[in-house]
Amino acid sequence: YPYDVPDYAGMLGSARCEPPAVGTACTRLCRPRSAPSRCGPGLRPCAPLEDECEAPLVCRAGCSPEHGFCEQPGECRCLEGWTGPLCTVPVSTSSCLSPRGPSSATTGCLVPGPGPCDGNPCANGGSCSETPRSFECTCPRGFYGLRCEVSGVTCADGPCFNGGLCVGGADPDSAYICHCPPGFQGSNCEKRVDRCSLQPCRNGGLCLDLGHALRCRCRAGFAGPRCEHDLDDCAGRACANGGTCVEGGGAHRCSCALGFGGRDCRERADPCAARPCAHGGRCYAHFSGLVCACAPGYMGARCEFPVHPDGASALPAAPPGLRPGDPQRYL
């Protein structure tokens, strides 16, 4: 593929780039060509060093396309004003740490100046710590250099985990790239993709990541690989003793006829079991419900209303033909 390279390619000021970096800003990673005339898959001649091939440089998966970039495969460096492992977190100015210094017009808080570790200058998973003058990178095994940018690891060392395919990296001066199998990510395929975080199971199904596959454990009334099918909850479900089936929320419910209860209306219900008659009223089971015979001085369907001494009741009015003390039918 075409590539414009100025005469000073491979130089940064007057300093030559350290292998495997080349290019005007020492940002292009190259490795020896696999054959005199062509480069391997995804690789191309790395001008101006025609005996090398350039590996495609890809940032860490998830690195923000707006606020992140990379200079080593698998890293994510943040542009000014952004932070976090994937450069998705704005540098906060909202917490007031000190009364001194310049303040933000919007919050009145101190705006911290850029620290030497902002944007994490340490590549390849190195951790950054501030020093009095600058910063220091603590590099993971297999990396070294000021910013952990130099890899001493080759494909021969098997740096790709979880069945990742290693490309490039024939010698310690060249970069390698891990092509991860489905379900894994990271510069060394070391991170399992939490596929359940995408909530693939619908209708409240429980997601199970089995490694080789995703499984959904569906709630009652739902089916399908992603619990996408809403089953007819009442299909084939009979409610006994004249009860009617009611669908709802992935489970069927029976609305039972009077005198019956339970999930399928198979249990004979004693309407008096709950002691519905207040103030010592006596309960009688009746074909249409229950009847309360109220103790003297009380009236109402559940004997809940006292009868006043002068004969007036607390009810607005007794229904015609119904005297205080008569049994009250509770429907």
Epitope: L57, V58, P65, E71
Partner: antibody, heavy 120, light 107 residues
């Protein structure tokens, strides 16, 4: 607030050279990691990537159009210029410029596009 | 170069329905695939990058999945403003390529 805006002729004749300018604000091409690219879209058709240029003057071109394309930047003016030689009616398209960060070869921020018609 | 094939070419659905769009790569692109939305007369807008990360300001009803060669964009419950053309794009190596697009239209 980042903005990108394309400008250039709306009509060019076959065999002529097209020169398009992308003027942007809210970021600088002197910032490490930042780049600007061009993408085109013929009427009713799909997007096609053309070229990219980065802060370090690294340039990338579409292989199918490499011989006809040149991308340059004017950092102080916040501009990127694309030239395309030997225009043909099939090059009639809306041309977009968009920002893309180094190693993160997606296009997160786009201009509104400019329609270029190639006709005699 | 990697060829991205999108299917279906056109998808006709109603608001509130679930949309599933597919993008297939001619060779593995790992998880380095993005989805864009384009409405008539507008520039494309980045929706999803690296297979399933949502871009800034994109509603949660948009989700992406897949890796290797097969990818899916899902819109869980379609809103009227979601009817547009959707493109996929890979960044696994040079040259960058886009799919031919899927038009999502109101039924």
């Amino acid at each position: 607030q980042i903005t990108l805006k394309e400008s250039g002729p709306t009509l060019v004749k076959p065999t002529q050279t097209l020169t398009l300018t992308c003027t942007f604000s809210g970021f600088s091409l002197s910032t490490r990691g930042v780049g600007v690219g061009w993408i085109r879209q013929p009427p009713g058709k799909a997007l096609e990537w053309l070229a990219l240029i980065y802060w370090n003057d690294d340039k990338r071109y579409s292989p199918s159009l490499q011989t006809r394309l040149t991308i340059t930047k004017d950092t102080p003016k916040n501009q990127v210029v694309l030239t395309m030689t030997n225009m043909d009616p099939v090059d009639t398209a809306t041309y977009y410029c968009a920002r893309s960060n180094w190693g993160n070869w997606y296009f997160a921020l786009w201009g509104r596009g400019t329609l270029v018609t190639v006709s005699s | 170069e990697i060829v991205l094939t999108q299917s279906p070419a056109t998808l006709s659905l109603s608001p509130g329905e679930r949309a599933t769009l597919s993008c297939r790569a001619s060779q593995s692109v790992s998880s380095y695939l993005a989805w864009y939305q384009q409405k008539p007369g507008q520039a494309p807008r980045l929706l999803i990058y690296d297979a399933f990360y949502r871009a800034t300001g994109i509603p949660a009803r948009f989700s992406g999945s897949g890796s290797g060669t097969d990818f899916t964009l899902t819109i869980s419950s379609l809103e009227p403003e979601d009817f547009a053309v959707y493109y996929c794009q890979h960044r696994s190596n040079w040259p960058i390529t886009f799919g031919q697009g899927t038009r999502l239209e109101i039924k």
